[in-house]
């Protein structure tokens, strides 16, 4: 092909070329032609003819301006037409009149101002018709009962101000899953708008200024349709009412998206005429007083985004939000509660009673006092099912005995990115028989006992990342209660001392984090007693980060009972010389981090075992001797592995000899080396 | 299941030694310390200290410190505790006991040595 | 160290009594508390652990309660087969001590 488009299996890519005209010598069979985003101010017919197999052609972001109905005389086969972003203006009848295939017709951000006639009564398998970002003023496309296939008709971001059935009565035998009218003027729905459509099940209208009073009336309009989804955020909705949503007592609303509205006052009984919503999105608004009653009547609602819901009008303490006791209580199939960022001032003996569904729970960063977790906290949650529960973010500084003795059933609990200080005795956890993740990252201080963790032996993982950890050099080991233990996280922790029997009893960890400590010593021939082998008997470990820890020494059966060990990060050290046999048993070894060490020489009889199924190497910046006995080997087998090695030109350099200083390590000339090199090649 | 069987019962003179063993099955030995507790005839029952079976490293009582001393032999799966010293008041049965999936209890115990002082 | 004391020393009750034991430690155990039975001649059989969490086979009889220092074992009616010497033993820092004993008898 002259252009420069790429073809891979019947699909042509011919976007970005800047192309004046429809290439003429792609492959005949293509069934997908992308022309996005070059300079065709029109598509002739006739340059399609030899692609008669194509079902998606998209020219979209062109400068095209008009269409010659015979196009899809020449693609009988087209399904998906694209002509976003072009200069379209007028649409006749004889347009699209041979598009008699096509689901897919995408018009939007184009220049229709208005749609005489009857353009799309051709297009009965039309699924999705895009009509947004243009300058439409009404709804009219027809002036006829047609598109009877039609299940999304967009038109988003025009200049619609009224809705009137006369002009949605074409689609009185269509069923719409999606009517997108977001971003318009509207201002009236005239009576019996949404009637005119055969079935209407979403309706989105973002963006959309309707405010408290005319809410009620398309609530009202709604009513007997069967609408289920029904999108109005950012619509100026400041307060609810017992009326506001009368209407939609006569519906099965199952999804009401009210995010971004401001929302201020929300009245008792506001959704009592929604007894089917299953997901209610109420994220950034501003409510200041939650009643007892704002959400009765939501039996069946299984998701609620509370997310950034109540915020506080000023510093002043009177004016942060209220949750009354409570007032959840209606929400008996809630399953998924998230009040992320909020400014809620504590958890009162009753907020939660009645989620007898709630499995997650997301109270991150949701609070301004509650610096003390007590045995009371979370006494209302004693009857949910709880399953995750975040707590992220919210200055916790103290957890009290028994604070999560309610949430048998919990799983997973993440406490990190708070300011917990103390010493963990274990009653803490007291009555999570079933808890599997512990994330306690990102904390004050925390200070191990032989019990921290005696009441959860079923804890699978366990993140205690720069928790400025203590006495974890005591014996027995804090962690020989968790003999489930898969993922240990100790990172950044600056650990100095540990025991060898530290990880003793946890043969199912498989991920153990301890970059970022001060291990060095540890490994140190001429540490008192000899180097601490505080690896043995993981024989199930896959992962092992050790990075920046300070080692300038490995003993040589450090890593022998790691028999799958897939991956190993020893970057960020001070090692120079590793002893022979040291990754012998590592068989399973996929990738290596050895970077930013010391490391001059890569000998065959160190490094052979840990490179023969390597997927990953990375040893950049590491001052290698360029000489033969150094690297030989090494080059040799850079040249030869399918290995990935990231950054191999660029650094790995040579730092001596002097004369081969900043030299590229792989350009290094083996072959004289053959000869006098005393070493098996 | 787990069991821990103890040697027999001792005849020891005042300022002997005595060794009680204590052989594990039913569960890898090194993973799980054992303890020692000794119940002095129609007495209560007193805890002695605990010793690692992988590596050796022993908590002791300190009433107990200077005349006790707790070994093992991984190969054979067996702990050992010797008290030096004997007095007449440390006639006694003698404990082997092992924690569970729950490190705060003993629901093993050996069936016991007596250990007679008596000149 | 922390020092047990259990008492009474010994009780006599009836078959079907409510029997009653409190172990008091000398500082904040937390709930790690172990009861034990012990009939004459025979090894310790434990009851309740973490002070109220009932072992395997145990019967539902018996029942603990407590947190802290004061703790509580509860036969809530005794049987001829209770009659044992009862033992509580704390788990928080070694030394692990053990209460001095309760001697429960039939009357």
């Known amino acids: 092909s002259t252009t420069k488009c790429t073809v891979s299996h019947e699909v042509a890519d011919c976007s970005h070329l800047k192309l004046t005209q429809v290439p003429d010598d792609l492959p005949t069979n293509i069934t997908v032609l992308n022309l996005t985003h070059n300079q065709l101010r029109r598509l002739p017919a006739a340059n399609f003819t030899r692609y008669s197999q194509l079902t998606s052609l998209d020219v979209g972001f062109n400068t095209i301006s008009k269409l010659e109905p015979e196009l899809c005389q020449k693609l009988p086969m087209l399904k998906v037409l694209n002509l976003q972003h072009n200069e379209l203006s007028q649409l006749s009848d004889k347009t699209f009149a041979f598009c008699t295939n096509l689901t897919e017709l995408h018009l939007m951000s184009n220049s229709i101002q208005k749609i005489k006639n009857n353009p799309f009564v051709k297009q009965k398998n039309l699924i999705t018709l895009d009509l947004s970002h243009n300058g439409l003023s009404s709804t009219k496309l027809g002036t006829q009962v047609q598109l009877e296939n039609l299940q999304e008709l967009l038109l988003s971001n025009n200049k619609i101000q009224a809705l009137k059935s006369e002009e949605l009565d074409i689609f009185a035998n269509s069923s719409l899953k999606k009517l997108e009218l977001s971003s318009n003027q509207i201002k009236e729905f005239s009576p019996g708008c949404f009637h005119a459509i055969g079935r209407l099940f979403g309706l989105f209208l973002n963006n959309v200024q309707l405010g408290p009073s005319l809410t009620e009336k398309l609530c009202l309009e709604l009513a007997n349709t069967s609408i289920r989804n029904l999108s109005l955020s950012n619509s100026q909705l400041s307060t609810t009412s017992n009326t506001t949503f009368l209407g939609l007592k006569w519906t099965n609303l199952t999804m009401l998206d009210l995010s971004y509205n401001n929302l201020n006052v929300v009245g008792n009984d506001s959704f009592a005429w929604l007894p089917q919503l299953e997901y209610f999105f109420l994220e950034y608004n501003n409510i200041q007083h939650l009643f007892s009653h704002s959400l009765h009547g939501l039996f069946n609602v299984r998701y609620l985004n509370l997310k950034r819901s109540f915020t506080k009008q000023s510093i002043s303490l009177a004016s942060l939000p209220k949750i009354d006791d409570f007032s959840f209580q209606w929400l008996k199939c809630l399953e998924h509660l998230n009040m992320e960022d909020n400014d809620i001032p504590g958890i009162k003996s009753n907020m939660f009673t009645g989620l007898i569904n709630l499995k997650y729970l997301s109270l991150s960063n949701s609070f301004t006092s509650l610096r003390t977790l007590t045995n009371e906290t979370f006494v209302s949650l004693a009857h949910s099912p709880l399953h995750i529960l975040n707590l992220t973010k919210n200055k916790i500084s103290k957890i009290e005995s028994d604070a999560f003795s309610w949430l048998g059933h919990l799983e997973v609990l993440d406490l990190g990115l708070n300011e917990i200080g103390q010493e963990l005795t274990g009653q803490e956890w007291r009555g999570l028989e079933n808890i599997f993740e512990i994330y306690l990252s990102y904390n004050k201080y925390l200070q191990l006992t032989r019990n921290s963790f005696a009441l959860v032996p079923s804890l699978q993982r366990l993140m205690l990342r720069r928790v400025a950890l203590k006495n974890v050099d005591s014996s027995p080991s804090p962690f020989q209660p968790l003999r489930n233990l898969t993922i240990l996280d100790l990172s950044n922790n600056n650990i100095a001392n540990i025991n060898d029997d530290m990880l003793e009893g946890l043969e199912k960890l498989e991920i153990l984090d301890l970059q970022h400590n001060n291990l060095a010593r540890l490994w140190k021939h001429a540490n008192p007693g000899g180097p601490i082998y505080f690896l043995k008997g993981l024989s199930h470990l896959h992962i092992l980060n050790l990075e920046s820890n300070g080692f300038d020494e490995i003993p040589v059966e450090v890593f022998k009972d790691l028999f799958e060990l897939k991956i190993i990060d020893l970057g960020l050290n001070n090692l120079n010389t590793l002893p022979a046999s040291v990754f012998n048993n590592q068989v399973s070894l996929k990738s290596l981090n050895l970077q930013k060490n010391l490391i001059t020489s890569v000998e065959k009889k160190v490094f052979g075992p840990a490179f023969r199924n390597l997927t990953e190497l990375d040893m950049r910046f590491n001052p290698f001797d360029c000489t033969c006995e150094s690297i030989a080997w090494f080059v040799n087998w850079i040249n030869e592995t399918h290995t990935n090695i990231p950054e191999l030109s660029s650094h790995y350099l040579c730092n001596t000899p002097p004369h081969y200083h900043g030299f590229p390590v792989r350009l290094f000339d083996t072959s004289s080396c053959k000869d006098s090199a005393p070493f098996e090649l | 299941q787990v069991q821990l069987v103890q040697s027999g019962a001792e005849v020891k003179k005042p300022g002997a030694s005595v060794k009680v063993s204590c052989k594990a099955s039913?569960?890898?030995?090194?993973?799980?310390?054992i303890h020692w507790v000794r119940q002095a005839t129609g007495q209560g029952l007193e805890w002695m200290g605990e010793?690692?079976?992988?590596?050796?490293?022993?908590n002791y009582n300190e009433k107990f410190k200077t005349r006790v001393t707790m070994t093992r032999n991984t190969s054979i799966s067996t702990a050992y505790m010797e008290l030096s010293s004997l007095r007449s008041e440390d006639t006694a049965v003698y404990y082997c006991?092992?924690?569970?999936?729950?490190?705060?209890?003993?629901?093993?115990w050996g069936q016991g040595t007596l250990v007679t002082v008596s000149s | 160290d922390i020092q047990m004391t259990q008492s009474p020393s010994s009780l006599s009750a009836s078959v079907g009594d409510r029997v009653t034991i409190t172990c008091r430690a000398s500082?904040?155990?937390?709930?790690?508390l172990a009861w034990y039975q012990q009939k004459p001649g025979k090894v310790p059989k434990l009851l309740i652990y973490?002070?109220?969490t009932l072992a395997d086979g145990v019967p539902s009889r018996f029942s603990g309660s407590g947190s802290g220092t004061d703790f509580t074992l509860t036969i809530s009616s005794l049987q001829p087969e209770d009659v044992a010497t009862y033992y509580c033993?704390?788990?928080?820092?070694?030394?692990?001590?053990f209460g001095g004993g309760t001697k429960v008898e039939i009357k």
């Open positions: 033993q704390h788990f928080w820092s070694t030394p692990f001590t």
């Open positions: 010793i690692n079976p992988n590596n050796g490293r022993i």
């Open positions: 006991a092992r924690v569970g999936v729950m490190i705060t209890t003993f629901p093993y």
């Open positions: 500082g904040n155990i937390h709930n790690y």
């Open positions: 039913g569960y890898t030995f090194t993973t799980y310390w």
């Open positions: 973490n002070a109220k």
